[in-house]
């Protein structure tokens, strides 16, 4: 059967969170999970390493924290489990622009029915160019 | 068959971008994948994590803009495809001794006979030890 | 047979590096390899995916350098191998909160009887949530 | 030829601001920082601070800091210091240097600029 | 900021022979294998010129007979044959951290 793996890229249109995500497009894949509202919805309980990449930029700093969550969802549980984050606090020089990423990847446990999303601290601050801005699993 | 797998190492001698690599030595590995002029050529098509990891350093910062992209070229498409980037800007106090390194990670579906490449804006900025610099993929 | 996998997380009751980490509860799991004293020790020969993300902050930036190191020891080699490290240098503006991660990657060839660990440089400048600061491979 | 060429001496009256002007030419510009470094008459050389010749900000000696003010114009290549309330311990040249970021120290230098503080 | 100190103030050598400088920090001015320790050579008139960098390293252009060593906080900058266009100031200083600082200079004078 085909491979569970995704990978997600950066959708603009991106207006809350968690992100949105474009799934079909240029470098964009999904095979074996679903993709949902911003979610990633396990197909079958397994190993997965799971990804994320977020590209945060501005035009004037004034050193907001920047926060970058991988996060899980199950109906079973009531509150969200984050699997992975970063959190950038005073990484640029004051009123001048600036530019930089965040990336996580890390293997978990995944249970068939799990949601996974990613959520971020300012929205208005990331560039969502396929290249920069992504998203992804695969099944061990 | 053996898998196909790569783990290139920095390599001193790089003179010009795309950048080339240690394939032989040292921590360096390729299986069923070939290292052509600083470009990994796929064998064989299929789903593939390339990861790669610049580290950069320089010893009175100037907050040059630093790129890191790995981009794929085949001779069906006239121009590159990146794949992955991360741009830096602003990112120490001027003046001042720096180091920091960018880290890409993802699945793309790669085709036989693609060439992934790793580019970068600084040459002169760039460590290339084999612990700090290094460009790889393997097949899912 | 069960795949050779492990994802060890943060142990906020480390005093001494090479760092400890926790393997039983959360969202750590362990199969096929080993874990102990602060290293995973493989059990079987192969290529693997090794991974670590450590979590810096601190209340009062100094620009310390950071070092965030995975090693290798094999009781064949008197020295340890360095496998991946990342090395950070004027990275916030001093007086200030900060905070920021390291995030290292790669496939590796290693024997049976290899141990694994991580190394830093700043033991105190760690936060040790799980989501944040973790250690894992997998088996290709 | 790679060259930094400063303006010339001044002559000034404790209180008022000198601005002093380096000129770089036979290199990028703006690959390296500029540098600004002082020796009074018969002393050893005192750094004053750096400017991003990419970025336009600086980083100042204590000792200068509120006085000292360095910037850059990038469309002429040239970077400018100003120190401001004048006193006759100023009285120095004052030299610009450039620093490569990928290299370990200020490899060129200006032919430096004489500021006399007199009343 | 880091203290750069001189010795000694003056030396006083003949042609041909050799000249020892030293320079001690008040703390290390290493970092991840290198040496940030520069050393400048300035004659009257002119601004410094740039002899040794990161300790060791010879800048192009200079002639052999100058050589560094050094590390941590102690260094030394070493002229093998004294030529006559050698007699002039010599500075260390630091650019491991800011503020960049200099030793006070050594005055190297014909005997």
């Known amino acids: 059967e085909p491979r569970s793996v995704a990978h997600l890229t950066g959708n603009p249109h991106s207006r809350s969170i968690p992100l949105e995500w474009e799934d079909t497009y240029g470098t964009a894949l999904i095979s074996g999970v679903k993709y949902k509202k911003g979610g990633l919805v396990i197909n079958e309980t397994g190993l997965y390493f799971v990804y994320s990449k977020v590209y945060f930029r501005g035009q004037s700093c004034n050193n907001q924290p920047l926060n970058h969550k991988v996060y899980m969802r199950n109906s079973k549980y009531p509150e969200d489990l984050v699997l992975m984050e970063e959190k950038r606090l005073n990484y640029c020089t004051t009123g001048q622009i600036w530019a930089h990423s965040s990336y996580l990847g890390a293997v978990f446990n995944l249970t068939s029915a799990d949601h996974l999303y990613v959520n971020i601290s300012q929205l208005s601050l990331i560039n969502f160019e396929e290249s920069k801005t992504f998203f992804g699993l695969y099944k061990l | 068959e053996p898998r196909s797998v790569a783990h290139l190492t920095g390599n001193p001698h790089s003179r010009s971008i795309p950048l080339e690599w240690e394939d032989t030595y040292g921590t360096a590995l390729i299986s069923g994948v070939k290292y052509k002029k600083g470009g990994l050529v796929i064998n064989e098509t299929g789903l593939y994590f390339v990861y790669s990891k610049v580290y950069f350093r320089g010893q009175s910062c100037n907050n040059q803009p630093l790129n890191h992209k790995v981009y794929m070229r085949n001779s069906k498409y006239p121009e590159d495809l990146v794949l992955m980037e991360e741009k830096r800007l602003n990112y120490c106090t001027t003046g001042q001794i720096w180091a920091h390194s960018s880290y890409l990670g993802a699945v793309f579906n790669l085709t036989s006979a693609d060439h992934l490449y790793v580019n970068i804006s600084q040459l002169s900025l760039i460590n290339f030890e084999e612990s700090k610099t290094f460009f790889g993929l393997y097949k899912l | 047979e069960p795949r050779s996998v492990a994802h060890l997380t943060g142990n906020p009751h480390s005093r001494s590096i090479p760092l400890e980490w926790e393997d039983t509860y959360g969202t750590a799991l362990i199969s096929g390899v080993k874990y102990k004293k602060g290293g995973l020790v493989i059990n079987e020969t192969g290529l693997y995916f090794v991974y670590s993300k450590v979590y810096f902050r601190g209340q009062s930036c100094n620009n310390q350098p950071l070092n965030h190191k995975v090693y290798m020891r094999n009781s064949k080699y008197p020295e340890d191998l360095v496998l991946m490290e990342e090395k950070r240098l004027n990275y916030c503006t001093t007086g200030q909160i900060w905070a920021h991660s390291s995030y290292l990657g790669a496939v590796f060839n290693l024997t049976s009887a290899d141990h694994l660990y991580v190394n830093i440089s700043q033991l105190s400048l760690i936060n040790f949530e799980e989501s944040k600061t973790f250690f894992g491979l997998y088996k290709l | 030829q790679v060259q930094l060429v400063q303006s010339g001496a001044e002559v000034k009256k404790p209180g008022a601001s000198v601005k002093v002007s380096c000129k770089g030419s036979?290199?990028?510009?703006?690959?390296?920082?500029i540098h600004w470094v002082r020796q009074a008459p018969g002393q050893g050389l005192e750094w004053m601070g750096v400017?991003?010749?990419?970025?336009?900000?600086?980083s100042y000696n204590q000792k200068f800091k509120g006085r000292a003010t360095m910037t850059v114009d990038k469309s002429t290549s040239t970077a400018y210091m100003e120190l401001s309330s004048l006193r006759s311990e100023d009285t120095a040249v004052y030299y610009c240097?450039?620093?490569?970021?990928?290299?370990?120290?200020?490899?060129?230098w200006g032919q430096g600029t004489l500021v006399t503080v007199s009343s | 900021e880091i203290v750069m100190t001189q010795s000694p103030a003056t030396l006083s050598v003949s042609p041909g022979e050799r000249a020892t400088l030293s320079c001690k920090a008040s703390?290390?001015?290493?970092?991840?294998?290198?040496?940030?320790m520069n050393w400048y050579q300035q004659k009257p008139g002119q601004p410094p010129r740039l002899l040794i960098y990161?300790?060791?390293n010879l800048e192009s252009g200079i002639p052999a007979r100058f050589s560094g060593s050094g590390s941590g906080t102690e260094f030394t900058l070493t002229i093998s044959s004294l030529q006559s266009e050698d007699f002039a100031v010599y500075y260390c200083?630091?650019?491991?951290?800011?503020?960049?600082?200099f030793g006070q200079g050594t005055k190297l004078e014909i005997k």
């Open positions: 703390q290390s001015v290493d970092y991840d294998g290198d040496s940030y």
């Open positions: 400017i991003s010749t990419y970025q336009g900000d600086a």
């Open positions: 990161a300790a060791s």
């Open positions: 036979g290199y990028t510009f703006t690959d390296y920082t």
């Open positions: 200083q630091q650019s491991r951290e800011l503020p960049y600082t």
């Open positions: 240097a450039r620093f490569p970021d990928w290299d370990y120290a200020m490899d060129y």
